[in-house]
């Protein structure tokens, strides 16, 4: 009956962790004698190819300084301990502790048997490192030039993480990769870039990080922060201001980052009706008179700059009873 070596084609281990490379001689054959079990790295330099051996009488030896006896052990193989005990070498599973990048590669498990000869199996050990992810908004001020408004960083992954962005904005990503502080790892940084405007402020974009060590992609929401001057509009005009009306109000509506620091109401004519009283963002009109036939201007300032809006007012002689007119400016 032929014997064969059962190994896994590929084994993945975490950097710094412990991994087992399974190796079994199958099936159990009566009278089959295993004279030596060896683990080798066929692709390593000649003096580092022989990694571990298990002798039926003398037990394990670890002939290569890399990985070395401190980091290697046979999981179940047992040597003969005297007259009555047979060596148990059918399971030659090898454990590697404190995995390093240099441990990655092909490993051959070989059984020297009598009378069947040598049989072997090969396993590819992949060393992976789970990256640590973070994403953050960059505080930016509006401009005409594309600017990085968010960063997504996947630190010390092996292989490098894949970063993408989910957003409805008009953007592009710029990626850089640098070696991590842990040898063999890579830190990936993706810069979410757009022309910063008020439209982007407060918008949440999502950084998506994919890595084979993750069961599912990591999704990290980032709320953008764009400093921009006030964007102003005026509401409250209903196209039905008539002489003597007393319940009229104009509101200066603002979107800005940071918050407005001041509101200023004026008219384009330069004359300001005395019955109009500015109260911050509101202009309260006590009684409409003919001086209101003008254009009101609301000017808003914040730390970045200023914005303004105009509202043309038409004063009627009598109320318009035909129906409510359009509001806003």
């Amino acid at each position: 009956q032929d014997v064969r070596v059962q190994v896994l084609p590929e084994v993945r281990g975490q950097l710094g962790g412990t991994v087992e490379l399974p190796c079994h001689l199958l099936p159990p054959v009566p009278g089959l004698y295993i004279s030596l079990v060896t683990w080798q790295r066929p692709d390593a330099p000649a003096n580092h190819q022989n990694v571990a051996a298990f002798h039926p009488k003398m037990g394990p030896s670890f002939p290569s300084p890399k990985p070395g006896s401190e980091r290697l052990s046979f999981v179940s193989a047992k040597q003969s301990t005297g007259q009555d005990t047979e060596a148990e070498l059918q399971d030659a599973t090898l454990a590697l502790h404190g995995l390093t990048v240099e441990d990655e590669g092909n490993y051959t498990c070989e059984f020297a048997t009598f009378p069947k000869g040598s049989v072997r199996g090969m396993t590819w050990l992949r060393v992976i490192a789970k990256p640590k992810n973070q994403a953050e908004a960059q505080k930016v001020t509006f401009s005409q030039d594309p600017t990085t408004v968010a960063l997504c960083i996947s630190k010390e992954g092996r292989p490098p993480a894949r970063i993408s962005w989910l957003s409805s904005l008009d953007w592009e990503a710029k990626e850089t990769q640098v070696s991590g502080t842990l040898a063999g790892t890579v830190t990936v940084t993706s810069r979410f870039t757009l022309v910063p405007s008020g439209r982007a402020d407060g918008v949440t974009v999502t950084c998506k990080v994919e890595h084979e060590s993750f069961e599912e992609p990591a999704l990290i929401p980032v709320t953008l922060s764009v400093r921009y001057p006030p964007e102003v509009s005026i509401s409250g005009y209903d196209d039905n201001w008539y002489l003597g009306r007393t319940d009229a109000t104009l509101s200066c509506d603002v979107r800005s980052n940071p918050e407005p620091t001041g509101y200023d109401w004026s008219t384009t004519s330069g004359t300001f009706p005395t019955s109009a009283v500015a109260q911050g963002s509101q202009l309260v009109i006590h009684a409409v008179d003919s001086l209101f036939n003008t254009t009101f201007v609301c000017t808003v300032t914040n730390a970045v700059g200023m914005g303004r809006a105009e509202q043309v007012i038409f004063v009627r002689e009598t109320p318009n009873t035909a129906g409510a007119g359009a509001t806003g400016g």
Partner: antibody
Framework: QEQLKESGGRLVTPGTPLTLTCTAS????????MSWVRQAPGKGLEWIGV??????STYYASWAKGRFTISKTSTTVDLKITSPTTEDTATYFC??????????WGPGTLVTVSS | SFVLTQPASVQVNLGQMVSLTCTAD??????ASWYQQKPGQAPVLLIY???SRPSGVPDRFSGSTSGNTATLTISGAQAGDEADYYC?????????????FGGGTQLTVTG
């Protein structure tokens, strides 16, 4: 540079115990099975015994049992000749076992047993 | 006990191929190794695990086994190959263990 060097060989009178020491450099002795081999003048190689990498097992040639003791520390392997006879006159080599072969040898140390 | 038999001496002409044999008195369950030893020097491992060659050993040295016999072949012998050659194997039979050397073959390169 991986090296082995034997020491302690000298002229002794029959029956006087003698300990030879093999010192390793450039590698860790605890990772390897280590053997002692001797060669009488003009004769062939003769295996004396082995100590396992862990130090937990020692095996001797049938003719050497009781006449020799092998022990090890983290950097040395010792061979004690308990009661030398004139037939023990030889060059004594320590050797490192790797995958079924002795791939590193010391230059040898000469032991002469004479009255 | 386990015995390995080698011819005491073999001659070969310079540049010729030569095969050195090593016969076990009982069928070995283990690998054969071959060593070269020059006068006044320590042995050097040439072949281990029947056919494997350590790094640094010229590829004109090769090993093979068939039944009870292990063979070291030197293809294109050189003057520097003149030396004693020892075969060896480990005897794992029973509860004990020993490593056994053959008696050695003295190789002379002529011409």
């Amino acid at each position: 540079q991986e090296q082995l060097k034997e020491s302690g060989g000298r002229l002794v009178t029959p029956g006087t115990p003698l300990t030879l020491t093999c010192t390793a450099s450039g590698f860790t002795i605890s990772s390897y099975h280590m053997s002692w081999v001797r060669q009488a003048p003009g004769k062939g190689l003769e295996w004396i015994g082995v100590i396992s990498a862990s130090g937990g097992s020692t095996y001797y040639a049938s003719w050497a049992k009781g006449r020799f003791t092998i022990s090890k520390t983290s950097t040395t392997v010792d061979l004690k000749i308990t009661s030398p006879t004139t037939e023990d006159t030889a060059t004594y080599f320590c050797a490192r076992e790797s995958y079924g072969g002795y791939n590193l040898w010391g230059p040898g140390t000469l032991v002469t047993v004479s009255s | 006990s386990f015995v390995l038999t080698q011819p005491a001496s073999v001659q070969v002409n310079l540049g010729q191929m030569v095969s050195l044999t090593c016969t076990a008195d009982t069928l070995s369950r283990s690998y054969a190794s071959w060593y070269q030893q020059k006068p006044g020097q320590a042995p050097v491992l040439l072949i281990y695990r029947d056919t494997s060659r350590p790094s640094g050993v010229p590829d004109r040295f090769s090993g093979s086994t068939s039944g009870n016999t292990a063979t070291l072949t030197i293809s294109g012998a050189q003057a520097g190959d003149e030396a004693d050659y020892y075969c060896a194997t480990d005897d794992n039979s029973g509860s004990s263990y020993q490593y056994v050397f053959g008696g050695g073959t003295q190789l002379t390169v002529t011409g």
